[in-house]
């Protein structure tokens, strides 16, 4: 499926606190992003 939200800002985090410190992290937690990333499995044990 196409991704309505791109993923150029994957490093952004949301820091709760004063309103001025908020970051828009919705793209990183969007349905579109989840479709891109899928369910990432745990790495295999060696």
């Amino acid at each position: 499926l196409a991704d309505p939200l791109d993923h150029r800002d994957a490093g952004d985090l949301w820091f709760p606190g004063e309103s001025e410190s908020f970051e828009d992290a919705h793209v990183e937690h969007s349905i579109s992003r989840s479709l891109l990333e899928g369910e990432i499995p745990f790495p295999p044990t060696s």
Partner: antibody
């Protein structure tokens, strides 16, 4: 195909309660932040509630208009979010949408009237 | 609360002609990461809202490139380069930076 399907709307008397559900499918649900947005007839959009993911301790946020009366929750095993609405008022009458902000459901209608 | 205002509230348009909607926020929506948390939605008659633009200027997937978003920290513009009949509906700007999240009042776009 991504689907968000709201249910649970209906007619309720002032002071009553209602629980809305939003069943999702077609995407990995657990890391997605979800919201409820409502729209009174002929009016604009009003954000009312937000729930983050397990990794964010399921943090919740509310609009002042519903704080203390509405509760947003999620069941990751059922890929469903909920909106428990108590002490309903006539001004809560609206179409309620669940959304990830990029995808939206079709909405469910809540009517509060005596 | 962050107040979002839009103008005009009603916009008669001619197919094939350009159109522009303005949105203003009562505080800057620019984050410390350089992201501007301004989103545009279109709600077509009888439908749910659909995302057009996110983070001020990014076109959502499946949205025709005749739509574009621009602006600064508090003043934003949605432009349609050539309006088509399917573009009618109510356009909303929104901010998802500061709680409570807020939408503009909407701009109703109709064909002349």
């Amino acid at each position: 195909e991504v689907q968000l399907v709201e249910s649970g709307g209906g007619l309720v008397q002032p002071g009553g309660s209602l629980k809305l559900s939003c069943a999702t499918s077609g995407f990995p649900f657990s890391n997605v932040w979800m919201h409820w947005v409502r729209q009174a007839s002929g009016k604009g959009l009003e954000w009312i509630a937000h729930i983050k993911a397990k990794s964010d301790n399921y943090a919740t946020y509310y609009a002042e208009s519903v704080k203390g009366r509405f509760t947003i929750s999620r069941d990751d095993s059922k890929t469903t979010i909920y909106l428990q609405m108590n002490s309903l008022k006539t001004e809560d009458t609206a179409v309620y949408y669940c959304t990830g902000l990029d995808y939206w459901g079709q909405g469910t209608t809540v009517t509060v009237s005596s | 609360d962050v107040v979002m205002t839009q103008s005009p509230l009603s916009l008669p348009v001619t197919p094939g002609e350009p159109a522009s909607i303005s949105c203003r926020s009562s505080r800057s929506l620019l984050t410390s990461k350089g992201i501007t948390s301004l989103y545009w939605y279109l709600q077509k008659p009888g439908q749910s809202p659909q995302l057009l633009i996110y983070r001020m200027s990014n076109l959502a997937s499946g949205v025709p490139d005749r739509f574009s978003g621009s602006g600064s920290g508090t003043d934003f513009t949605l432009k349609i380069s050539r309006v088509e009949a399917e573009d009618v509906g109510v356009y909303y700007c929104a901010q998802f930076l500061v709680y409570p999240y807020t939408f503009g009042p909407g701009t109703k776009v109709e064909i002349k």
